[in-house]
Interface confidence: medium
Amino acid sequence: LQDLCSNCPAGTFCDNNRSQICSPCPPNSFSSAGGQRTCDICRQCKGVFKTRKECSSTSNAECDCISGYHCLGAECSMCEQDCKQGQELTKKGCKDCCFGTFNDQKRGICRPWTNCSLDGKSVLVNGTKERDVVCGPSPADLSPGASSATPPAPAREPGHSPQ
C-alpha cells in the first residue's frame, strides 16, 4: 500500500478515503513533493505582506512586503520599516548615521568608514553618511619620485552586516 502512495506526484495527495488514489490538492493548498498524505495550506500574503508568487498545487505562495517595508526572517516572516540611505532604524524611528559611519542601503545599521591607514593607504574620497570612504594609494606612493606604474588599489567593498 505504501508503494501506491509513493506514486502520487507533487500537487496531489494520497487519499486514504478513496483507496489511496492520488487526488489533486484542493484549492488553496499544495504538495511540493510526491507521496504526501495531505496537502499543506497555502500561505496567505495579507496585511503588511503582498504576494510575490501565487500559490500553485506544487508550491507555496511567496510573500514580499508592501512599499516602505522590507522582509526579515526566513521566507519573509516579518516586515520592517525602511529608512533612507544614510540612516538606520532605531526604536524611535529612522535616525541619521553618526559622523564616521555610513549606510548605503534602506535597511540595516550604520557601519564605520573603512580605516584606510590600516591597509597602508590614504583617503582618496571622504566618506559620507551614505557612502564609505574610498581608499587610494599609500602616502608613500604619492611622494615625489615614487613609481606610478602600480595602479591604485580598488576601493574595498564594504562588508555587509547580516540583515
Epitope: 496585511g47 503588511v48 505582506f49 508592501i66 512599499s67 516602505g68 517595508y69 526579515l72 516572516s77 516579518m78 516586515c79 520592517e80 520599516q81 532604524l89 526604536k91 524611535k92 524611528g93 529612522c94
Partner: antibody, heavy 122, light 107 residues
Framework: EVQLVQSGAEVKKPGASVKVSCKVS????????MHWVRQSPGKGLEWMGS????????IYAQKFQGRITMTEDTSADTAYMELSSLRSEDTAVYYC???????????????WGQGTLVTVSS | DIQMTQSPSSLSASVGDRVTITCRAS??????LNWYQQKPGKAPKLLIY???SLQSGVPSRFSGSGSGTDFTLTISSLQPEDFATYYC?????????FGQGTKVEIK
C-alpha cells in the same frame, strides 16, 4: 486572529495608582508588540508607550516618564500598564493595542482592546 | 514631535455622498500614515495603513492616498454605518501622533 480583552473600569483617588490589564488570545504575547493609547473625555488619542518583544525594550512617551510602567506576564499572555500619581486629568479610557503579526515597528495599531475607563476623582 | 492636523474638524454629509478628509504632517513622513474610524463608546478601528493599504475586512469604498506631508482619506459613497469620527496617525517616528479627529455627521 489576535484578540485583546482588558480589565474593567476603575475609580481612583488623586495620588493613587491604577493597573490596567490586557489579555491576549489567538497568539502568544511574545509574538506581539504591545502599545498603550489613552483617550480623555471628548478628546483625541494619545500614545503612552510601547513594548517591543524582539529585545524586551519599552519606550514611554515623555509626558508619562516616571509615572508609567508597562509589564508583561508571558505565562498568562497578559500585558499590564500601571500609571501612578494619578490626577484628575488622567481620567480617560485606556486602550491596549498591537501592531499586527509580522510587523516590526510598523507602529500602526490593530487590533485594539475594548478600553478601560479610569476615573480619577476625590 | 510630529504634529498631525486634520481638516475639517467636522462635516455633515448624506448617504451616498463622496467624502474627503485631509491630514497634514508638520514634516515629511513618507508613506507612514494610518487612518482609523471610531464610533461612540468603541475602540478605534484601523481602516488604512501605510497611506494607501486597505486593512483586511474594510470595505473598498474607503481609500487613502498621499505621501510626504499631505494625505487624504476618501469614502466614495457614504453608508449609514460610516457616520463616525476619523483619525489619522503618523508611524514615521516615535512618539506616534494622531490628528485631532474629523467627525462625520448626518446632514
Amino acid at each position: 486572529e489576535v484578540q485583546l480583552v482588558q480589565s474593567g473600569a476603575e475609580v481612583k483617588k488623586p495620588g493613587a495608582s491604577v493597573k490596567v490589564s490586557c489579555k491576549v488570545s489567538g497568539y502568544t504575547l511574545t509574538e506581539l508588540s504591545m502599545h498603550w493609547v489613552r483617550q480623555s473625555p471628548g478628546k483625541g488619542l494619545e500614545w503612552m508607550g510601547s513594548f517591543y518583544p524582539e529585545d524586551g525594550e519599552t519606550i514611554y512617551a515623555q509626558k508619562f516618564q516616571g509615572r508609567i510602567t508597562m509589564t508583561e506576564d508571558t505565562s498568562a499572555d497578559t500585558a499590564y500598564m500601571e500609571l501612578s500619581s494619578l490626577r484628575s486629568e488622567d481620567t480617560a479610557v485606556y486602550y491596549c493595542a498591537t501592531e499586527g503579526v509580522g510587523v516590526i515597528r510598523g507602529n500602526w495599531f490593530d487590533p485594539w482592546g475594548q478600553g478601560t475607563l479610569v476615573t480619577v476623582s476625590s | 514631535d510630529i504634529q498631525m492636523t486634520q481638516s475639517p474638524s467636522s462635516l455633515s454629509a448624506s448617504v451616498g455622498d463622496r467624502v474627503t478628509i485631509t491630514c497634514r504632517a508638520s514634516q515629511s513622513i513618507s508613506s507612514y500614515l494610518n487612518w482609523y474610524q471610531q464610533k461612540p463608546g468603541k475602540a478605534p478601528k484601523l481602516l488604512i495603513y501605510a497611506a494607501s493599504s486597505l486593512q483586511s475586512g474594510v470595505p473598498s469604498r474607503f481609500s487613502g492616498s498621499g505621501s510626504g506631508t499631505d494625505f487624504t482619506l476618501t469614502i466614495s459613497s457614504l453608508q449609514p454605518e460610516d457616520f463616525a469620527t476619523y483619525y489619522c496617525q503618523q508611524s514615521y517616528s516615535t512618539p506616534p501622533t494622531f490628528g485631532q479627529g474629523t467627525k462625520v455627521e448626518i446632514k
